[in-house]
């Protein structure tokens, strides 16, 4: 499954297309792959119309989920399994994947893992959580891999495209923003460049591609000459106040 990067505590993952439905309709919760919320025409989808994601194995679900039938015991209707929320510490489990990151399944109970150097919820800005990547952690350990960024690369300010943790790691005129599988230094936006208009507080953590903010004296507004039927699919650009 697609790599998912934990950006901050506001990150909401696994907002998939409805069962049997095609993704991409405006106003629906859309995910191009388990674990990744995507930006459809600059319209950020929210939990308001959450739909379960069908799956065959745990790997198809996000870090905070596991694959199982929705009803206890027997498989769901027609044997359908969906991604279910992971189980917290001290909850019952049958395998590691059922437990939330930082925990593992021991004697049927989710227990804290010794491998988890960063307690969940702490210093989340300082880790990149790689899910479903091709370079697997030790087989069967049941934990998402967490990789910290090497401190030695921060002696000089990051140039465009270099990895970063926060904007202060980047050179002037750049900000630290998510770019598919990583966070890199990107240029602050200039007039006319595509920007992202966030519909609600905290939504910046949802994007698989983050853009920097518009530069001084500019605001992110709907492109005036962008004639499209639906407001939701219009591009926003940085425009003079």
């Amino acid at each position: 499954t697609l790599n998912s990067v934990l950006i901050n505590s506001n990150a909401i993952k696994n907002l998939p297309p409805p069962l049997g439905g095609a993704g991409g309709q405006p106003g629906s919760a859309v995910s191009v792959a388990p674990g990744v919320l995507y930006e459809g025409g600059n319209k950020y989808q929210t939990l308001d119309n959450y739909q379960p994601y069908p799956c065959a194995e745990d790997e198809e679900c996000g870090s905070d989920e596991y694959c199982s039938s929705p009803s206890r015991g027997a498989a769901g209707v027609g044997g359908v399994q969906i991604c279910l929320a992971c189980r917290k510490r001290r909850k019952r489990c049958m395998r590691h994947a059922m437990c939330c990151p930082g925990n593992y399944c021991k004697n049927g109970i989710c227990m804290p893992s010794d491998h988890s150097h960063f307690p969940r919820g702490e210093i989340e800005e300082s880790i990149i959580e790689n899910l479903g990547n091709d370079h697997n952690a030790a087989a069967g350990d049941g934990y998402p891999r967490r990789t910290t960024l090497t401190s030695k690369i921060y002696h000089t300010k990051g140039q465009e495209g270099s990895v970063c943790l926060r904007s202060s790691d980047c050179a002037a005129g750049l900000c630290c923003a998510r770019h598919f599988w990583s966070k890199i230094c990107k240029p602050v936006l200039k007039e006319g460049q595509v920007c992202t208009k966030h519909k609600r507080k905290g939504s910046h953590g949802l994007e698989i591609f983050q853009r920097c903010y518009c530069g001084e004296g500019l605001a992110c507004r709907i492109q005036k000459d962008h004639h499209q039927a639906s407001n939701s699919s219009r591009l926003h650009t940085c425009q003079r106040h």
């Epitope: 697609l2 993704g23 792959a33 459809g40 790689n130 990789t147 465009e160 495209g161 698989i208």
Partner: antibody, heavy 118, light 112 residues
Framework: QVQLVESGGGLVQPGGSLRLSCAAS????????MSWVRQAPGKGLEWVSV??????????YYAASVKGRFTISRDNSKNTLYLQMNSLRAEDTAVYYC?????????WGQGTLVTVSS | DIALTQPASVSGSPGQSITISCTGT?????????VSWYQQHPGKAPKLMIY???NRPSGVSNRFSGSKSGNTASLTISGLQAEDEADYYC???????????FGGGTKLTVLG
């Protein structure tokens, strides 16, 4: 300035192996993800693999067409990117480019030709 | 197999404007407001011309511009010049196994 120089290409028989290298200079190599992209003769570009900035235990991704046969790696102390290619097939014949994956493929090498033929 | 669809060729006269289209699906190009364009002259390495839909890297002429609507992205070159004659490739990201996808390429011919 940023420079990427590939080497290691050549003629190899089907089923054989080859290891490509890419020497990087002019930028902080250890701060960038790096990729391999290939181009079959007269054809378009095809992404092959990408590796995280870290050289030990870093994340890697592969195109479905090479997964299980190719291995990407890097040595940050030598500013070098590698591509180990095993079980080569005729369809792997291409110019292999090493590319810096900053904001997309912002710098490319000149490429090295790999020919798989009996 | 090509994930993004581009016209095989386009042509224009010096001074004219041309547009190259790139069509994908909701799983790749349509799924993200994100696309890049590369220029490749014969026997040379590709060069990044546009990223993030319509952003130009430093050193790229402002005659090159990008846009995107739905599942289709476009590269427009205004004031065509002889040196613009090259192959152009779009690139996006995708869900599933292949994380990076390219278009099949478009050969731009500058007439005259």
């Amino acid at each position: 300035q940023v420079q990427l120089v590939e080497s290691g290409g050549g003629l190899v028989q089907p089923g054989g192996s080859l290891r490509l290298s890419c020497a990087a200079s002019g930028f902080t190599f250890s701060s960038y993800w790096m990729s391999w992209v290939r181009q079959a003769p007269g054809k378009g570009l095809e992404w092959v693999s990408v590796i995280e900035h870290k050289d030990k235990g870093g994340t890697t991704y592969y195109a479905a067409s090479v997964k299980g046969r190719f291995t990407i790696s890097r040595d940050n102390s030598k500013n070098t990117l590698y591509l180990q290619m095993n079980s080569l097939r005729a369809e792997d014949t291409a110019v292999y480019y090493c590319a810096r994956h900053g904001i997309d493929f912002d710098h490319w090498g000149q490429g090295t030709l790999v020919t798989v033929s009996s | 197999d090509i994930a993004l669809t581009q016209p095989a060729s386009v042509s224009g006269s010096p001074g004219q404007s041309i547009t190259i289209s790139c069509t994908g699906t909701s799983s790749d190009l349509g799924g993200y407001n994100y696309v890049s364009w590369y220029q490749q002259h014969p026997g040379k390495a590709p060069k990044l011309m546009i990223y993030d839909v319509n952003n130009r890297p430093s050193g790229v002429s402002n005659r090159f511009s990008g846009s995107k609507s739905g599942n289709t992205a476009s590269l427009t070159i205004s004031g065509l010049q002889a040196e613009d004659e090259a192959d152009y490739y779009c690139q996006s990201y995708a869900s599933g196994n292949t994380k990076v996808v390219f278009g099949g390429g478009t050969k731009l011919t500058v007439l005259g």
